[in-house]
Interface confidence: medium
Amino acid sequence: GLNDIFEAQKIEWHEGSHHHHHHHHGSGSLVPRGSGSVPRWRQQWSGPGTTKRFPETVLARCVKYTEIHPEMRHVDCQSVWDAFKGAFISKHPCNITEEDYQPLMKLGTQTVPCNKILLWSRIKDLAHQFTQVQRDMFTLEDTLLGYLADDLTWCGEFNTSKINYQSCPDWRKDCSNNPVSVFWKTVSRRFAEAACDVVHVMLNGSRSKIFDKNSTFGSVEVHNLQPEKVQTLEAWVIHGGREDSRDLCQDPTIKELESIISKRNIQFSCKNIYRPDKFLQCVKNPEDSSCTSEI
C-alpha cells in the first residue's frame, strides 16, 4: 500500500491551489469602447478575459463528467450552466459573493468519500496525476464543480448580459471578489468542510514558501477543516531536485502550518517525497521490487 511506497523512498515522519488572493479592491481603468461619435466606456481589467468558448466548454465538461460518473447522471447540465451563468452575468465583476454561487453549489452537490480527500497547493499537476492513478482519492478538480472550472477564467459586465472576453479582474491589481476567486473560495471551503479522518495535502517543496498562508489551501481550506471530523492533516512535501535530500518537513513554513493545525485540535504529520516520479511509479505498480526496498 501507500505506506510501503513511502517507506521505499526514505520517508521521514514528523508527528505533531488554487490561487487565493489578498483582499485589495481596485477599480480597473476606464477605456473608450469605440471611436464613434458617442463614445461609450467600459471596464478594462488587468487580468485575462473569459476563456474562449467558455459556455461550450462548461457544458461539454459537465456532459463528459456525468457520463463518466454514474452517481452524477441525474445532473441536468443545461441547468448547471444556467446556474453558473447566473452567478456572474450582469453583475459587477468586483462585487461577486458566495451567495451568487449557491444555486450552482446546490446543483453540483456531490458526496465524495470524506476520508479520501487530497488537498494541494502550488502543485496541481502532480496532485491530479496521483488521483488519476490512485482512483479512490479525490482532489477538488475530481469533483463536478472543480472539473467544470479548472483552468478557466470568466467574468461578465455590470448591467449587461454580455460575457467579457477581453479582460477580467486580477485579484491583486483589481479586486479579490471577482467571479473566479469567489468560485474557488466557495468550492474550496465546502470541500474542506466535507473532509474527515486523515486529510492529505500535497505541497510544493521547490517554492520559497512551501506552505503559503495566502494560497487557497492556507487561507481557506486549512481554516475550514472540521476538528470534530478530521483527526490528522498529513502533508506530503514534494521535492524538485534529483539530489535534494534535505528534510523539508523542518521548513519554517511547515512548522507554521503545524502550529495552525495543532491550535485547531487536529494532529499533523509530514512526509518528504524525495522522488515524485518514483512515487507515482510506485503508486501505479506497488508490486515493483524497487518499491518495497528503500531507495
Epitope: 469602447r33 464613434g36 474562449k52 461550450e56 454580455k162 467579457n164
Partner: antibody, heavy 119, light 111 residues
Framework: QVQLKESGPGLVQPSETLSLTCTVS????????VNWVRQPPGKGLEWMGR???????DYNSALKSRLSISRDTSKGQVFLKMNSLQTEDTAIYFC?????????????WGPGTMVTVLS | QFTLTQPKSVSGSLRSTITIPCERS????????VSWYQQHLGRPPINVIY?????PSEVSDRFSGSIDSSSNSASLTITNLQMDDEADYFC??????????FGGGTKLTVL
Amino acid sequence: QVQLKESGPGLVQPSETLSLTCTVSGFSLTSYGVNWVRQPPGKGLEWMGRIWNDGSIDYNSALKSRLSISRDTSKGQVFLKMNSLQTEDTAIYFCARGPYNNYWYFDFWGPGTMVTVLS
Amino acid sequence: QFTLTQPKSVSGSLRSTITIPCERSSGDIGDNYVSWYQQHLGRPPINVIYADDQRPSEVSDRFSGSIDSSSNSASLTITNLQMDDEADYFCQSYDSNIDIIFGGGTKLTVL
C-alpha cells in the same frame, strides 16, 4: 497599411479539395485572428471559421467535418482546406481580420477570390 | 443557435432617412454585440457599425446603429441618403461561444 489577399484555384472539380491562402501584411498573425467567410453568388455571407492569434481554431459546426484552417506566422499566411466540394460550395471566399477586443466583428477584409465548383 | 432576420429590400429617396431592422430569433439582442457591413456589388464588405452603435472613424456620421429590447432587434439608420449608399447591408452578431452569425442581408435602393 493593413491588407489581406486571398489566392487559390478559380475552378475545382466536384468531390475535390479546395486549398486557399490568405496573405496578410500590415499586422501580425500573433496579434490578430483571421476568419474565413464565403458568399455564394447573389446570396448572403456565411462564416466558415477562424484561427485565433494564439493559434487555436474554431469552425462553423455545419462545415466542421470538411474544414481545416492553419497558418504560417513567419510568412503571414493563413490556409483554408475544404474537402468533398459540391456545386453549392461555389462562392466568393473572403478572409477577414477579427480584432480580439470583445466586439467580434471584422475590421479589414480581403477582396475575395471566386471559386467555382464545376457541375 | 439564434438567427438574424433582415428584410430582403428597403428603399428610400435621395436625402431621406431609412432604417434597416435586424431581428434576433432567440435570446436577448443585448446578449451579444451587433455589427453592420455595407457591400457594394463585386466588392468585399466594409464595417460601418460595431459594438451595437460604434462607428469606425472613417465612416460617415450619417450611419448610426442601435438596439431595441422591446422588438429584440438591432437597427442601422442612414440619414441624408446618397446615391452611393445603394448597396447590400448585413447585420452580424455572435453566439456565446463567439461563433459568428450573419443576417441574410438587405438590398438598399436609393430612389
